[in-house]
Amino acid sequence: SAPFSFLSNVKYNFMRIIKYEFILNDALNQSIIRANDQYLTAAALHNLDEAVKFDMGAYKSSKDDAKITVILRISKTQLYVTAQDEDQPVLLKEMPEIPKTITGSETNLLFFWETHGTKNYFTSVAHPNLFIATKQDYWVCLAGGPPSITDFQILENQA
């Protein structure tokens, strides 16, 4: 059956970029790197310059939603993190500009950002029970939980 968000007519309007040039580290202290053009994976790095730097853009929902809805873009590019299905790699989608309005099937570009202390979780708006996750010897993907790692630390202001 289609995900809930596809059935509803919720519209998400772009507000602003709320974070620039941050790194995501998983619970094993692995950083997200860009692998082979359109994929992301996690690796323990000696040189943090190899880690992807992301920007985060905030969206406001047409229904009064308390959740923070965000888009993730690789800094200084037009590449946006895009969800597929469970256990499928997230992809990098090239778009000429940040979408002003997102609805329907395009919600695979959006994530609910939740924080619990220093732990950050990104739930797919298109698949609300699935998180951005790292998985051993695999790409960054969508997963429901263990054995995939779904909590991330945000590292800002890395030189």
């Epitope: 040039e21 997200i32 790197i33 860009r34 692998a35 082979n36 053009d37 994929y39 994976t41 690796a43 310059d49 190899e50 880690a51 992807v52 730097k53 992301f54 690789i74 800094s75 200084k76 590019t77 590449l79 010897d137």
Partner: antibody, heavy 122, light 107 residues
Framework: EIQLVQSGAEVKKPGASVKVSCKAS????????MNWVRQAPGQDLEWMGW????????TYADDFKGRFTFTLDTSTSTAYMELSSLRSEDTAVYFC???????????????WGQGTTVTVSS | DIQMTQSPSSLSASVGDRVTITCRAS??????LNWYQQKPGKTPKLLIY???RLYPGVPSRFSGSGSGTDYTFTISSLQPEDIATYFC?????????FGQGTKLEIK
């Protein structure tokens, strides 16, 4: 230790084909694209193109479309560059080089093979 | 496609000299510029990535700067082992073009 080891020098006649190999070790082969770079005698470096080592999809620079083919054997972490219908102007050193993204946006070639000299002569 | 224009094509300098090479891109490459060193008969080596970041193990006498379309590579005090050809390369978009190279010789 990360290494790219290329096959040995080749001498071919015009019209023949050549296949150069590049065996990678010391890293996860499918995480990094493989580039091919040509250097004719006394000339500059020319970026020929790259192959996505996960999907096998290749991208070729305009001057290298047609007679050049990049392939893979992921079971042995080896990339190949095949050149058909050889001409004298194909005489050059061919390098493979691992591609890496810095900050997820800026592409560089951080490890290089030792180069394979291909000589085309009748 | 982005074209890279490197100058000078050759350069003669003395040991201890400060040496500067420039590279100009045909459009803004957002600091996504790398420099390589190739010694005679050897494989190219990455020296500097993202305009100014020194690749691990590279001596600190090598440096890079620039923005937009104009970039500079500098050797602060030339050493005999620096005799090589130096290439810039843009890493922003396909195709990842190299500059024409600068051959550096000792006076």
């Amino acid at each position: 230790e990360i290494q790219l080891v290329q096959s040995g020098a080749e001498v071919k006649k015009p019209g023949a084909s050549v296949k150069v190999s590049c065996k990678a070790s010391g890293y996860t082969f499918t995480n990094y694209g493989m580039n091919w770079v040509r250097q004719a005698p006394g000339q500059d470096l020319e970026w020929m193109g790259w192959i996505n080592t996960y999907t096998g999809e290749s991208t070729y620079a305009d001057d290298f479309k047609g007679r050049f083919t990049f392939t893979l054997d992921t079971s042995t972490s080896t990339a190949y560059m095949e050149l058909s219908s050889l001409r004298s102007e194909d005489t050059a050193v061919y390098f493979c080089a691992r591609g890496i993204y810095y900050y997820g946006s800026s592409y560089a070639m951080d490890y290089w093979g030792q180069g394979t000299t291909v000589t085309v002569s009748s | 496609d982005i074209q890279m224009t490197q100058s000078p094509s050759s350069l003669s300098a003395s040991v201890g000299d400060r040496v500067t090479i420039t590279c100009r891109a045909s459009q803004d490459i957002s600091n996504m510029l790398n420099w390589y060193q190739q010694k005679p008969g050897k494989t190219p080596k990455l020296l500097i990535y993202y305009t100014s970041r020194l690749y691990p193990g590279v001596p600190s006498r090598f440096s890079g700067s620039g923005s937009g379309t104009d970039y500079t590579f500098t050797i602060s005090s030339l050493q005999p082992e620096d005799i090589a050809t130096y290439f810039c390369q843009q890493g922003k978009t396909l195709p990842y073009a190299f500059g024409q190279g600068t051959k550096l010789e000792i006076k």
